[in-house]
């Protein structure tokens, strides 16, 4: 008789999840010499231990502590780029500006990027059929808790000027409910972080509005100012040109506003 299985509203665990995590870990540690000491089998065991045999709506940050410990990595704290709803451009940027880091440029962020996973209470099985959706099912699911944990730690590690890339094409350029708005903003350390500089990325070619005056940006400014962190905002009118100028800063067209 087939055992009854909980049906969740979200997609199930990414196929070949264990193999993907292990392969990514090996690749990352080969590319980053400072992480060569990492034992990827231990990393996978710790990752698995965070959610296997546990109810997928009852995961805590504590469950991920062994993984956090194994994935400990020192990132230059003044070279951190946060992003919200504009991941691809942020990653393109750090691929060019190699001394800056998004969360997904760290080992733990790289391992989990774009993956879904969950287990089942009291069985060692991975659930490939469905996993809890943050809104429809529960917020304390394995994926959400993982990203909340690593995002909090990443923000806590930041110092000096922290940059955040925001999507100017969205109705809420700054969204209080995003990971940036709900976790990272509140975990920047005022004693370490001098300034949060927002880069608002414009979508339309002819969009010349000053999106730094957007009400949601003003809301971000207010939150940051109340935490005694300075705030700065820049419009990136031409993201294509912006990336090009990061690649070739000496280009004569790069002195004008991007």
């Amino acid at each position: 008789v087939p055992r009854w299985r909980q049906q969740w509203s979200g997609p199930g665990t990414t196929k070949r999840f264990p193999e993907t995590v292990l392969a990514r870990c090996v690749k990352y540690t080969e590319i980053h010499p400072e992480m060569r000491h990492v034992d990827c089998q231990s990393v996978w065991d710790a990752f698995k231990g965070a959610f296997i045999s546990k109810h997928p709506c009852n995961i805590t940050e504590e469950d991920y502590q062994p993984l956090m410990k194994l994935g400990t990595q020192t990132v230059p704290c003044n070279k951190i780029l946060l992003w919200s709803r504009i991941k691809d451009l942020a990653h393109q940027f750090t691929q060019v500006q190699r001394d800056m880091f998004t969360l997904e440029d760290t080992l733990l962020g790289y391992l989990a990027d774009d993956l879904t996973w969950c287990g089942e209470f009291n069985t060692s099985k991975i659930n490939y059929q469905s996993c809890p959706d943050w809104r429809k099912d529960c917020s304390n699911n394995p994926v959400s808790v993982f990203w909340k944990t690593v995002s909090r730690r990443f923000a806590e590690a930041a110092c000096d000027v922290v940059h955040v890339m925001l999507n100017g094409s969205r109705s809420k350029i700054f969204d209080k409910n995003s990971t940036f708005g709900s976790v990272e903003v509140h975990n920047l350390q005022p004693e370490k972080v001098q300034t949060l500089e927002a880069w608002v990325i414009h979508g339309g070619r002819e969009d010349s509005r000053d999106l730094c005056q957007d009400p949601t940006i003003k809301e971000l400014e207010s939150i940051i100012s109340k935490r005694n962190i300075q705030f700065s905002c820049k419009n990136i009118y031409r993201p294509d040109k912006f990336l090009q100028c990061v690649k070739n800063p000496e280009d004569s067209s790069c002195t004008s506003e991007i």
Partner: antibody
Framework: QIQLVQSGSELKKPGASVKVSCKAS????????MNWVRQAPGQGLEWMGW????????TVADDFKGRFVFSLDTSVSTAYLQISSLKAEDTAVYYC?????????WGQGTLVTVSS | DIVLTQSPASLAVSPGQRATITCRAS??????????MHWYQQKPGQPPKLLIY???NLESGVPARFSGSGSGTDFTLTINPVEANDTANYYC?????????FGQGTKVEIK
């Protein structure tokens, strides 16, 4: 290039007030907070606190609360340190220094002498 | 407050030799692997000059003869080789926890 230029030396009598200025240039003033550091003659360095140049919010170290006030005029990219009810022990060189918490940029210092 | 204790209080070094100054913090100044300890040089009548930030990062324009190391509570500034114009006072400073504090200073003289 980035520069912090402070006002000149001051000779004051006990009980008087003094206002030291620190004019910044070469960067966006409101992007970096301004710190104040005191150095008494022949002594070491003491951090007095800082002012958030974006909001104007001052943070004054406990040892300097009361008579020491940080202020700004962002229109001229200038930070100010005002000391009231001056005492002989306030005689020192006062420096402004730009954030973050490690100070790559310093003013040249302002000597405040308190003597009757 | 975090107390920083520098040693020695003074030292005399011959040109071409190595000078080592240590700074001990009363508690750790580390945050996720970054150490919030910095080193300055101050010559008479001048403001301090940043040499090393966050324990081991050489400030732009500072000669590579200066280096910093350490983590947690124990930090070292090394000048190797020492040159005649390195005569100055050297200070460590932490920015891990407000109030920021400085060490009492080390006077370096060249023999």
């Amino acid at each position: 290039q980035i520069q912090l230029v402070q006002s000149g030396s001051e000779l004051k009598k006990p009980g008087a007030s003094v206002k030291v200025s620190c004019k910044a240039s070469g960067y966006t003033f409101t992007n970096y907070g301004m710190n104040w550091v005191r150095q008494a003659p022949g002594q070491g360095l003491e951090w007095m606190g800082w002012i958030n140049t974006y909001t104007g919010e001052p943070t004054v170290a406990d040892d300097f609360k009361g008579r020491f006030v940080f202020s700004l005029d962002t229109s001229v990219s200038t930070a100010y340190l005002q000391i009231s009810s001056l005492k002989a022990e306030d005689t020192a060189v006062y420096y402004c220094a730009r954030n973050p918490g490690w100070f790559a940029y310093w003013g040249q210092g302002t000597l405040v002498t308190v003597s009757s | 407050d975090i107390v920083l204790t520098q040693s020695p209080a003074s030292l005399a070094v011959s040109p071409g030799q190595r000078a080592t100054i240590t700074c001990r913090a009363s508690e750790s100044v580390d945050n996720y692997g970054n150490s919030f300890m910095h080193w300055y040089q101050q010559k008479p009548g001048q403001p301090p000059k940043l040499l090393i930030y966050r324990a081991s990062n050489l400030e732009s324009g500072v000669p590579a003869r200066f280096s910093g190391s350490g983590s947690g509570t124990d930090f070292t500034l090394t000048i190797n080789p020492v040159e005649a114009n390195d005569t100055a006072n050297y200070y460590c400073q932490q920015s891990h926890e407000a109030p920021w504090t400085f060490g009492q200073g080390t006077k370096v003289e060249i023999k």
